[in-house]
């Protein structure tokens, strides 16, 4: 069953620094920007297969969330559903469309600087780190008396990519989600058959950076479909 595949186990025995999930078909991907291991997902969906089945929100696209299609429906059957717009009812942040979050059961705008999400409990306060930023601006060594809530740095727990600093995205890492670097030119990427089909990956890679797209590496064109290596390339 899908669930038995999802209930994967310890990651081990792949090339260091990572291992692969025992009995797990998904790709094990290094969190390190330059050390990425390719891996196919044999449970990837077919292009025209709708709706897309899922087990977790992050398996869906950025404008979708994972839930049972019918109210009070079978919890075992879940699909990617369209995100909910402002003022619509919600149960968790992922149900709300980007730029919104779930507050008191309603999707509200996170544009005003009031959204800290649940990650306020693990506020990033970077120091001794040349790359630490404060919402995209360089952090000064002395801050004003106003408490700044800087965005999550690499390795920080997150709920969605907007929780992460510039150049990072929020991606699955085992049973949690953490901020990881957006991929640079030449780095291995995962090409999904349809938007959001992150399927059964234990590690999620971030998407390719601005001006880059995930394409088959030129010298891999002759390879079989299943083993084609995709990398981030200039448009």
């Amino acid at each position: 069953t899908l669930n038995s595949v999802l209930n994967s186990n310890a990651i081990k025995n792949l090339p260091p620094p990572l291992g692969g999930a025992a009995g797990h078909p998904g790709s094990a991907v290094s969190a390190a920007p330059g050390i990425l291991y390719p891996g196919g997902n044999k449970y990837q969906t077919i292009d025209n297969y709708q709706p897309y089945p899922c087990a977790e929100d992050e398996e869906c696209g950025t404008d979708e969330y994972c839930a049972s299609p019918t109210r009070g429906g079978d919890a075992g059957v879940q699909i990617c559903l369209a995100c909910r717009k402002r003022r619509k009812r919600c149960m968790r942040h992922a149900m709300c469309c980007p730029g919104n979050y779930c507050k008191n059961g309603i999707c509200v705008s996170s544009d005003q600087n009031n959204f800290r999400g649940e990650i306020e409990e693990t506020i990033t306060e970077s120091f001794g780190n040349d790359h630490s930023t404060l919402d995209g601006y360089s952090r000064r060594t002395t801050l004003s008396s106003k408490m700044y809530h800087s965005k999550g740095q690499e390795g920080s727990v997150c709920l969605r990519s907007s929780d992460c600093a510039t150049g990072l995205c929020c991606a699955r890492h085992f049973w949690s989600k953490i901020c990881k670097p957006v991929l640079k030119e030449g780095q291995v990427c995962t090409k999904h058959r349809r938007k959001g089909s992150h399927g059964l990956e234990i590690f999620q890679r971030c998407y390719c950076g601005e001006g880059l797209s995930c394409r088959i590496q030129k010298d891999h064109h002759q390879a079989s479909n299943s083993s084609r290596l995709h990398t981030c390339q200039r448009h």
Epitope: A32, D57, N129, Q153, G155, F174
Partner: antibody, heavy 115, light 108 residues
Framework: QVQLVESGGGLVQPGGSLRLSCAAS????????MTWVRQAPGKGLEWVSG????????YYADSVKGRFTISRDNSKNTLYLQMNSLRAEDTAVYYC????????WGQGTLVTVSS | DIVLTQSPATLSLSPGERATLSCRAS???????LAWYQQKPGQAPRLLIY???NRATGVPARFSGSGSGTDFTLTISSLEPEDFAVYYC?????????FGQGTKVEIK
């Protein structure tokens, strides 16, 4: 504020079973992966198991694989650890904690496996 | 498995002194997926640092984390009486996530 409260520990004979619970409050439970960590008396910390926010993804240390089962009930904001075929070396304080790096911990519950 | 080795095993210092704790990984972590915890007798551990250098909520500024690759450091700039405890590092790059054996910071 975030609170995690474990229960269910106690004395059990080798080969026996126990079910630990961890009641969570103060945060949106289903948004977070949860973790069980244990600490044998006078020893260091050892990761036991982890489970994703929806419960679809579970992970175990080799030392407990096949004997322990992690699960969660998001409607009750509760995390569980079902421990079967217990051994003397499973004797430890068991902590539940939030996320892959453990930003919040419970107070722990002592499990003693002895005949 | 990635083995984390902490040194020294015990650090004997006086209040006001600077403490430098080391955590060395058996493999390059490449990414800053390392956390530090403080544990006092009879208590649960407490997260101090995550992402190698990010201070957790409510942790005093005297605690700082640094390092990359295989070598990571927790620094307590000026020890307070309440800082005497055992400190653990943890890597969460690969499974099993592993902890160091701990460094005990005791009063000299």
């Amino acid at each position: 504020q975030v609170q995690l409260v474990e229960s269910g520990g106690g004395l059990v004979q080798p080969g026996g079973s126990l079910r630990l619970s961890c009641a969570a409050s103060g945060f949106t439970f289903n948004n977070y992966g949860m973790t069980w960590v244990r600490q044998a008396p006078g020893k260091g910390l050892e990761w036991v198991s982890g489970i994703s926010g929806s419960g679809s993804y579970t992970y175990y240390a080799d030392s407990v694989k096949g004997r322990f089962t992690i699960s969660r009930d998001n409607s009750k904001n509760t995390l569980y650890l079902q421990m079967n075929s217990l051994r003397a070396e499973d004797t430890a304080v068991y902590y539940c904690a939030r996320t892959i790096y453990m930003d919040y911990w419970g107070q722990g519950t002592l499990v003693t496996v002895s005949s | 498995d990635i083995v984390l080795t902490q040194s020294p095993a015990t650090l004997s210092l006086s209040p006001g002194e600077r403490a430098t704790l080391s955590c060395r990984a058996s493999q390059n972590l490449f990414s800053p997926y390392l956390a530090w915890y403080q544990q006092k007798p009879g208590q649960a551990p407490r997260l101090l640092i995550y992402g190698a250098s990010n201070r957790a909520t409510g942790v005093p500024a005297r605690f700082s984390g640094s390092g990359s690759g295989t070598d990571f450091t927790l620094t307590i700039s000026s020890l307070e009486p309440e800082d005497f405890a055992v400190y653990y590092c943890q890597q969460y790059l690969s499974l099993p996530t592993t902890f160091g054996q701990g460094t005990k910071v005791e009063i000299k």
